[in-house]
Amino acid sequence: EINGSANYEMFIFHNGGVQILCKYPDIVQQFKMQLLKGGQILCDLTKTKGSGNTVSIKSLKFCHSQLSNNSVSFFLYNLDHSHANYYFCNLSIFDPPPFKVTLTGGYLHIYESQLCCQLK
């Protein structure tokens, strides 16, 4: 979808943290991906290509992230109840043109079993 709920599993829990998966089409060569919590920018990653097809990856708001050929994963650690919120992947596509913006998201539910450092 261009704007709406992610039609894939956006949140992957492990070890008291969460991997937030932001997908983009394979065809996209240059882009900016922002992770929004509500309306606040938590993380961003920009991929551009320079002369000779050299790839540049930049982050203005750095989070631990992982880039693949069709997704960016942002990692949040030490989960607690304050992390429960709507999260959005805000994708700005520069190449191929035209410049396009898509927003997909979902609600991150926090359950006791997913919290970090529980007392057993």
Partner: antibody, heavy 122, light 106 residues
Framework: QVQLLESGGGLVKPGGSLRLSCAAS????????MNWIRQAPGKRLEWVSY????????YYVDSVRGRFTVSRDNAKNSLYLQMNSLRAEDTAVYYC???????????????WGQGTTVTVSS | DIQMTQSPSTLSASVGDRVTITCRAS??????LAWYQQKPGKAPKLLIY???SLEGGVPSRFSGSGSGTEFTLTISSLQPDDFATYYC????????FGQGTKVEIK
């Protein structure tokens, strides 16, 4: 009101040059990416060139790359298309068209000029 | 390159008819599709963007649907002003237009 007005078309011999202009009014020109689109007689519309709002990102259709140069002057609210080494197959009506806003992205080409006719013939 | 194919090429209809034009893309373009109306000697006019969003000022009798590779433009009740040529355009990767569908008076 929001308007685009092309000029500069005409009759030119093969191998010749023309410079098309597109004057924008009624909106903040520097906020928008722009296109040149052409339509040969009786044919479908064909995208020719695209330029970002700042002028730093430019794309061309393969058939004109190396011959045509797109540029813009945001201070003058103007878009240009310099056409060199013209061929008979470049004969068409040329339109400038407004495209993506630099924040919200593309929602189609929502404003078009009236077109200017380029005829390449000996 | 992504190819766009419209059908039919010509459509004969009467005022009040419901008209449907189909556009197929050679590969999936998600919902990055626009529809334009063009009258002889005039510039195209944007009707629909993002496959189904109605451009401001366009009458509600026009609607668009579809995603992926198959899209439709529907005119619910054809009016005299609607006789024109209609083009679909993909903007998923660069821009390509369909060959056009001429809606003429029956």
């Amino acid at each position: 009101q929001v308007q685009l007005l092309e000029s500069g078309g005409g009759l030119v011999k093969p191998g010749g040059s023309l410079r098309l202009s597109c004057a924008a009014s009624g909106f903040t020109f520097s906020d928008y990416y722009m296109n040149w689109i052409r339509q040969a007689p009786g044919k479908r519309l064909e995208w020719v060139s695209y330029i970002s709002n700042s002028g730093t990102t430019i794309y061309y259709v393969d058939s004109v790359r190396g011959r045509f140069t797109v540029s813009r002057d945001n201070a003058k609210n103007s878009l240009y298309l310099q056409m060199n080494s013209l061929r008979a197959e470049d004969t068409a009506v040329y339109y400038c068209a407004r495209d993506a806003h630099y924040v919200s992205g593309s929602e189609g080409m929502d404003v078009w000029g009236q077109g200017t006719t380029v005829t390449v013939s000996s | 390159d992504i190819q766009m194919t419209q059908s039919p090429s010509t459509l004969s209809a009467s005022v009040g008819d419901r008209v449907t034009i189909t556009c197929r893309a050679s590969q999936s373009i998600s919902s990055w599709l626009a529809w334009y109306q063009q009258k002889p000697g005039k510039a195209p006019k944007l009707l629909i963007y993002k496959a189904s969003s109605l451009e401001g000022g366009v009458p509600s009798r026009f609607s668009g649907s579809g995603s992926g590779t198959e899209f439709t433009l529907t005119i619910s009740s054809l009016q005299p002003d609607d006789f024109a040529t209609y083009y679909c355009q993909q903007y998923y990767s660069y821009w390509t237009f369909g060959q056009g569908t001429k809606v003429e008076i029956k």
